[in-house]
Interface confidence: low
């Protein structure tokens, strides 16, 4: 199990990097930060450390409620500061292992 | 290397409503913000919208006129306004807002609409 | 709205000279959203400066940009025959995003 969930935090990690290049990845992302209302990886401040990716701003799939720019410049009281591979890692334990 | 295409007709007359296409060869509209833009004879650059995988934004200048939507499997997005005016006869943008530079990075090469009777 | 206004309107120099655009916002822009675009005849504007300071690729270092909060500014440090053009500044920080009204940099 912890293996799993070691494999799935590096594996999340390593689409946030390919996600201001690949589509296809960006749409899996958004997906999963949406459904789980969950935005990076420990918490949303891994996006500013993806390069490419400026300091202020993260993924849409990221805010609460979808503004006007809400990924740009956005405001921490707008968007989900709770990571993504604890949040679906609770749900994959709880489900799936 | 994304390229984007404006279509549309070139004429549209005053009330009717102007309707413009974007085709994005080279990359998917589903990520990256998607904008309209505009460059009335003589004048300067006028930002209309975007759309990002279906939310969107408008200037709200034209905001009760404007509506910016997108077709994923036509890789496609589009422009519509409504109630026009000799005011809209414009050079008609649109553009990519690219998560590299966070500004608009990739242009089409401009269509004119005139409005006129 | 934010207000970009640009200064001057129209720039004569001849090639080989400096060209200082500044470009003033009504109020204080976040500067990684600050940007820079060259506009020839007929042409698409193609973006030279983002995030005030940053080149966008394919653009060489004789075009830098500079600023931070009102006040913001394009240099080109020695001009070339392809540089005669219009230049936008363009903040996209804060909806609506705005555009400058142009400096046109002409031939004297």
């Known amino acids: 199990r912890d293996k799993v969930m070691s494999e799935f935090n590096n594996n999340f990690r390593q689409q946030m990097e390919n996600y201001p290049k690949n589509n296809h990845t960006a749409s899996i992302l958004d997906r999963m930060q949406a459904d789980f209302k969950c935005c990076g990886a420990a918490n949303y401040t891994d996006w500013e450390k993806i390069p490419s990716m400026s300091k202020n701003r993260v993924p849409d799939s990221c805010c609460i409620n979808v503004t006007v720019g809400c990924g740009i410049n956005f405001n921490e009281k707008a968007i989900h500061k709770e990571g993504c591979v604890e949040k679906i890692g609770g749900w994959l334990r709880k489900n799936v292992l | 290397q994304v390229q984007l295409q404006e279509s549309g007709p070139k004429v549209v007359k005053p009330s009717e409503t102007l309707s413009l296409t974007c085709t994005v060869s080279?990359?998917?509209?589903?990520?990256?913000?998607w904008n309209w833009i505009r460059q009335s004879p003589g004048k300067g650059l006028e930002w209309i919208g975007y759309?990002?995988?279906?939310?969107?934004d408008y200037n709200p200048s034209l905001r009760s006129r404007v509506t910016i939507s997108e077709d994923t499997s036509k890789n496609q997005f589009s422009l519509r306004i409504s109630s026009v005016t000799a005011a809209d006869t414009a050079v008609y943008y649109c553009a990519q807002m690219g998560w590299g530079s966070h500004a608009f990075d990739m242009w089409g090469q401009g269509t004119m609409v005139a409005v006129s009777s | 709205e934010i207000v970009l206004t640009q200064s001057p309107g129209t720039l004569s120099l001849s090639p080989g000279e400096r060209a200082t655009l500044s470009c003033r916002a009504s109020q204080s822009v976040n500067s990684r959203y600050l940007a820079w675009y060259q506009q020839k005849p007929g042409q698409a504007p193609r973006l030279l400066i983002y995030g005030a300071s940053s080149r966008a690729t394919g653009i060489p270092d004789r075009c830098s940009g500079s600023g931070s909060g009102t006040d913001f500014t394009l240099t080109i440090s020695r001009l070339e025959p392809e540089d005669f053009a219009v230049y936008y500044c363009?903040?996209?920080?804060?909806?609506?995003?705005?555009f400058g009204q142009g400096t046109k940099v002409e031939i004297k």
């Open positions: 363009q903040q996209y920080g804060s909806s609506p995003w705005t």
């Open positions: 080279g990359g998917s509209i589903s990520s990256y913000y």
């Open positions: 759309t990002k995988r279906g939310y969107t």
